[in-house]
């Protein structure tokens, strides 16, 4: 058993048939010695009396908020949560496996630049009685500070018969130098509590590997005289690291017909303009990627040819 | 990815082209190592990230863009010693910080060159003959060093009398290539920045 936060404890349980469970001794936080009674989860039914209460925790129903009272007055609370281990593996029932980029990916993170700011998100089908708490650091043995905000519900989607909820959190490395060469990864730890179930999820990454620039901005077309060609121009996204001559991007320009089956013409360039042939009903799209370290491409910025 | 390769203008900052070649060569070598050594811990997640230049050179600090010198977090250990210009500074008025930056890059290359050559000598003794260093990568390191043209004492190649542990050598190769790729990215950023300014 260990303390998650003040008055909240996690009991780690090996889950198998006939498992003996974990014996937990709760002590009432009071100088009082006599006349103390114990109740569980808002019930007025008395479970036991005395300064300590011994319980055998075997399953979720044995957890909950234990309260000690004296003469109708609440003295202290202890909330017990369960962390379930089956076949040596901690349960991952609360979050959905996103399976990208690999199986058992519960947390996904992205950064728009090298400022040390990043966003992580996760998915669940659970809609109520759910809380998350996020901690992060650079490295684990001698951790350096990363500050994370509160996790918030950022999107809801319908998937077949199920509703899916996306939560996200923003974190910022306390003292980040955009030009630094990372040798220790960022560690992100998410504590998830659903009803009386506790689970934890972790992710480890270098900012350089989770970079995904915003799409190029101000995408414009300029027709060239007496030609089907157009000059496409764009700018670096506002959120990209500066100076741009140091944090350079490379771009992919694509001409796409109305039908998905039509052949796509693609040009790669380090410049912020390109000359392409604009077909009728086609659209021109541009996306960006770090020029020197091939992490993710941005989403496309698009304009119609007409 | 196969991007069109720009050929540099004669008047262009001479080292930019070499640094682009360097990044391409080390990235290819790393990809080859990952594929060839697929049953070794050779991915970014699996290896220990070591920097052989740590405490010996200060490339990131010395080559910091002016715009980032206001960032407290980037100024932990900036050194300000004066080093004479190399040929990449061709006819440019440059601050001593730029000279320090380029000499720091030169020292990095020299250190990695020695490590890679020593390692290659060991790999050539491996009866499995599983992996060797790409001669192109070693040549590109050499070309960039020549373009930087800093006079510095030659470091003798390390020789070892004991029987090499090939498993350890291959893991060390992965560690070295990952670190060198990160440094090559920094070098490319620096050259691009210097070229623009």
């Amino acid at each position: 058993i260990w303390e998650l936060k003040k008055d909240v404890y996690v009991v780690e349980l090996d889950w198998y048939p006939d498992a003996p469970g974990e014996m937990v001794v709760l002590t009432c936080d009071t100088p009082e010695e006599d006349g103390i009674t114990w109740t569980l989860d808002q019930s007025s039914e008395v479970l036991g009396s005395g300064k300590t209460l011994t319980i055998q925790v075997k399953e979720f129903g044995d957890a909950g908020q234990y309260t000690c009272h004296k003469g109708g007055e609440v003295l202290s609370h202890s909330l017990l949560l369960l962390h379930k281990k089956e076949d040596g593996i901690w349960s991952t029932d609360i979050l959905k496996d996103q399976k990208e980029p690999k199986n058992k990916t519960f947390l996904r993170c992205e950064a728009k630049n090298y400022s040390g700011r990043f966003t992580c998100w996760w998915l669940t089908t659970i809609s109520t009685d759910l809380t998350f708490s996020v901690k992060s650091s650079r490295g684990s043995s001698d951790p350096q500070g990363v500050t994370c905000g509160a996790a918030t519900l950022s999107a809801e989607r319908v998937r077949g018969d199920n509703k899916e909820y996306e939560y996200s959190v923003e974190c910022q490395e306390d003292s980040a130098c955009p030009a630094a060469e990372e040798s220790l990864p960022i560690e992100v730890m998410v504590d998830a509590v659903h009803k009386l179930k506790y689970e934890n999820y972790t992710s480890s990454f270098f900012i350089r590997d989770i970079i995904k620039p915003d799409p190029p901005k101000n995408l414009q077309l300029k027709p060239l005289k007496n030609s089907r060609q157009v000059e496409v121009s764009w700018e670096y996204p506002d959120t990209w690291s500066t100076p741009h001559s140091y944090f350079s991007l490379t771009f992919c320009v694509q001409v796409q017909g109305k039908s998905k089956r039509e052949k796509k013409d693609r040009v790669f360039t380090d410049k912020t303009s390109a000359t392409v042939i604009c077909r009728k009903n086609a659209s021109i799209s541009v996306r960006a990627q770090d020029r020197y370290y091939s992490s993710s491409w941005s989403e496309w910025a698009s304009v119609p040819c007409s | 990815r196969n991007l069109p390769v720009a050929t540099p203008d004669p008047g262009m900052f001479p080292c930019l082209h070499h640094s682009q070649n360097l990044l391409r060569a080390v990235s290819n070598m790393l990809q080859k190592a990952r594929q060839t050594l697929e049953f070794y811990p050779c991915t970014s997640e699996e290896i220990d990230h070591e920097d052989i230049t740590k405490d010996k050179t200060s490339t990131v600090e010395a080559c910091l863009p002016l715009e980032l010198t206001k960032n407290e977090s980037c100024l932990n250990s900036r050194e300000t010693s004066f080093i004479t210009n190399g040929s990449c500074l061709a006819s440019r008025k440059t601050s001593f910080m730029m000279a320090l930056c380029l000499s720091s890059i030169y020292e990095d290359l020299k250190m990695y060159q020695v490590e890679f050559k020593t390692m290659n000598a060991k790999l050539l003794m491996d009866p499995k003959r599983q992996i060797f260093l790409d001669q192109n990568m070693l040549a590109v390191i050499d070309e960039l060093m020549q373009a930087l043209n800093f006079n510095s004492e030659t470091v003798p190649q390390k020789s070892s009398l004991e029987e090499p542990d090939f498993y350890k050598t291959k893991i060390k190769l992965c560690i070295l290539l990952h670190a060198f790729r990160i440094r090559a990215v920094t070098i490319d950023r620096v050259m691009s920045y210097l070229n623009a300014s």
Epitope: W15, G21, L40, D41, Q42, S43, E45, L47, I55, Q56, V57, K58, E59, F60, G61, D62, A63, G64, Q65, K84, K195, L196 | -
Partner: nanobody, 124 residues
Framework: EVQLVESGGGLVQPGGSLRLSCAAS????????MGWFRQAPGKGLEFVAV????????YYAESVKGRFTISKDSSKNTVYLQMNSLRAEDTAVYYC?????????????????WGQGTQVTVSS
């Protein structure tokens, strides 16, 4: 999902005893409490007894206190209701139910899963 199957009901004389069983299957580890409720002819659903977890707490309706005992065999995922000193007013269909709710475990509206019921008749 949790499936519940009751057994053990029947006809018994006043003062007699019966033991009801409720076998749970499916995602039983999600349940917080299991309880027994009853419905007499022409009456509403009434709380009888509930067991929390593996038996850390048990709650009883005033009308059955001292006569009925609820227990659980966690290894078999089975809850029992031992009914002694049965009276005519105990005649009803007895339902086993399971809840994933922490609170109001004596309130049938908080229960998620129900068995099909077993008839108990107390008559001479």
């Amino acid at each position: 999902e949790v499936q519940l199957v009751e057994s053990g009901g029947g006809l018994v004389q006043p003062g007699g005893s019966l033991r009801l069983s409720c076998a749970a299957s499916g995602r039983t580890f999600e349940t917080i409490a299991m309880g027994w409720f009853r419905q007499a002819p022409g009456k509403g659903l009434e709380f009888v007894a509930v067991i929390r977890g593996s038996g850390v707490a048990t709650y009883y309706a005033e009308s059955v206190k001292g006569r009925f005992t609820i227990s659980k065999d966690s290894s078999k995922n089975t809850v029992y209701l031992q009914m002694n000193s049965l009276r005519a007013e105990d005649t009803a269909v007895y339902y086993c139910a399971a809840t994933t709710n922490r609170f109001k475990n004596t309130d049938y509206t908080t229960y998620d899963y129900w068995g099909q019921g077993t008839q108990v008749t107390v008559s001479s």
